[in-house]
């Protein structure tokens, strides 16, 4: 079933997703798409990647991370209600049905009237269990900054714990870095 | 005008070896997905495999996966299927088809086909 | 898998009357990976309707498509002598692409 994220209307959402790159710069084809991942590539492409670059996007769509270290989590800007839906990250990795998908639940929610409140959770919190997802190879221990050690295994949405769009910003701006073997 | 134009069909025996080939021509043959399809006597539509217009990614229905191989040479403008331990079941006409779902476009469907070639299998 | 299943098997009318066809996929399909095909004998497929409703390039728009979920259905609103063929639903939302097994429709 999908993870999902939260965010609110007039705000950016973000939807994370990760791989590393097996050498510097040799970068793997990702495709983002509105829509549930289907048998192949993304449907509704808002944005893709190559093995170089960005080569396709459309307005409101964006990467904030550093792809080319793998980061290819997804920026939306300034939601309105119609940008709810499931979106499909697809990590096109050559060979045989190797590619990775992943589907990300998108909620958005009314604006607030009152005051935005203080966060409310620390990060210990926020992670009560190790973070485990399939993988094809060995599992890797990575220290995420000064945030409390989380296994991960291969290839990661980073947050199938994750809940929301505010808390998966804070990840992101603590200089949060996933490793893949 | 856009076309595929299938060949190498043939009789094998069980247990032997065939290779199919596809000519694309009228589009830009490396921005596409394409698949194989076959059609057993008298029966329906079977996907088979499809390929990646750069060739790096691959999938196979369970029936053929270990036996059949899909590749392509873009240089060429070609699509091919290498069929091994071919199965009495395998006796179908097999097409090719571009599958329509092009960079930066939103369109699943398989919009341009050959006419076929037939692939019987038999002692 | 997911299995899709056609009704009627065979659907015989007239020209001039209207067809409805009928896909039913055994798990949710997204309408933008359904697509129906016309078949006639010795002959490919030709692709109709894609995305679950566009007509594909040079479909009259005698033929539509429509439904969501798990129910799809492809209507032909007056039937053409040529329209007598088999007609094949598709999808593409999960691996392995999967057609249905076909409907006959035949000149009654």
């Known amino acids: 079933s999908e993870v999902e994220y939260r965010a609110e209307v007039g705000q950016n959402a973000y939807l994370p997703c990760f791989y590393t790159p097996a050498a510097p710069g040799n970068l793997v084809p990702v495709c983002w798409g509105k829509g549930a991942c289907p048998v192949f590539e993304c449907g509704n492409v808002v944005l893709r990647t190559d093995e170089r670059d960005v080569n396709y996007w459309t307005s409101r769509y964006w990467l904030n991370g550093d792809f080319r270290k793998g980061d290819v989590s997804l920026t939306i800007e300034n939601v309105t209600l119609a940008d709810s839906g499931i979106y499909c990250c697809r990590i096109q990795i050559p060979g045989i049905m190797n590619d990775e998908k992943f589907n990300l639940k998108l909620v958005i929610k009314p604006a607030k009237v009152t005051p935005a409140p203080t966060r409310q959770r620390d990060f210990t919190a926020a992670f009560p269990r190790m973070l485990t997802t399939r993988g094809h190879g060995p599992a890797e221990t990575q220290t995420l900054g000064s945030l409390p050690d989380i296994n991960l295994t291969q290839i990661s949405t980073l947050a199938n714990e994750l809940r929301d769009s505010r808390l998966a910003n804070d990840l992101r701006d603590s200089g949060a870095t996933i490793r893949i073997g | 005008q856009v076309q595929l134009v299938e060949s190498g069909g043939g009789l094998v025996k069980p247990g032997g070896s065939l290779r199919l080939s596809c000519a694309a021509s009228?589009?830009?043959?490396?921005?596409?997905?394409m698949s194989w399809i076959r059609q057993a006597p008298g029966k329906g539509l079977e996907w088979v495999s499809f390929i990646s217009g750069s060739g790096s990614i691959i999938y196979y229905a369970d029936s053929v996966k270990g036996r059949f191989t899909i590749s392509r040479d873009n240089a060429k403008n070609s699509l091919y299927l290498q069929m091994n331990s071919l199965r009495a079941e395998d006796t179908a006409v097999y097409y090719c088809?571009?599958?329509?779902?092009?960079?930066?476009?939103?369109?699943?469907?398989?919009?341009?086909w050959g006419q076929g070639t037939t692939v019987t299998v038999s002692s | 898998e997911i299995v899709l299943t056609q009704s009627p098997g065979t659907l015989s009318l007239s020209p001039g009357e209207r067809a409805t066809l009928s896909c039913r996929a055994s798990q949710s399909v997204s309408s933008s990976y359904l697509a129906w095909y016309q078949q006639k004998p010795g002959q490919a497929p030709r692709l109709l309707i894609y995305g679950a409703s566009s007509r594909a390039t040079g479909i009259p728009d005698r033929f539509s498509g429509s439904g969501s979920g798990t129910d799809f259905t492809l209507t032909i609103s007056r039937l053409e002598p040529e329209d007598f063929a088999v007609y094949y639903c598709q999808q593409y939302g999960s691996s392995p692409i999967t057609f249905g097994q076909g409907t006959r429709l035949e000149i009654k």
């Open positions: 009228g589009f830009t043959f490396s921005d596409y997905y």
């Open positions: 088809a571009r599958d329509g779902m092009v960079r930066g476009m939103n369109f699943y469907g398989m919009d341009v």
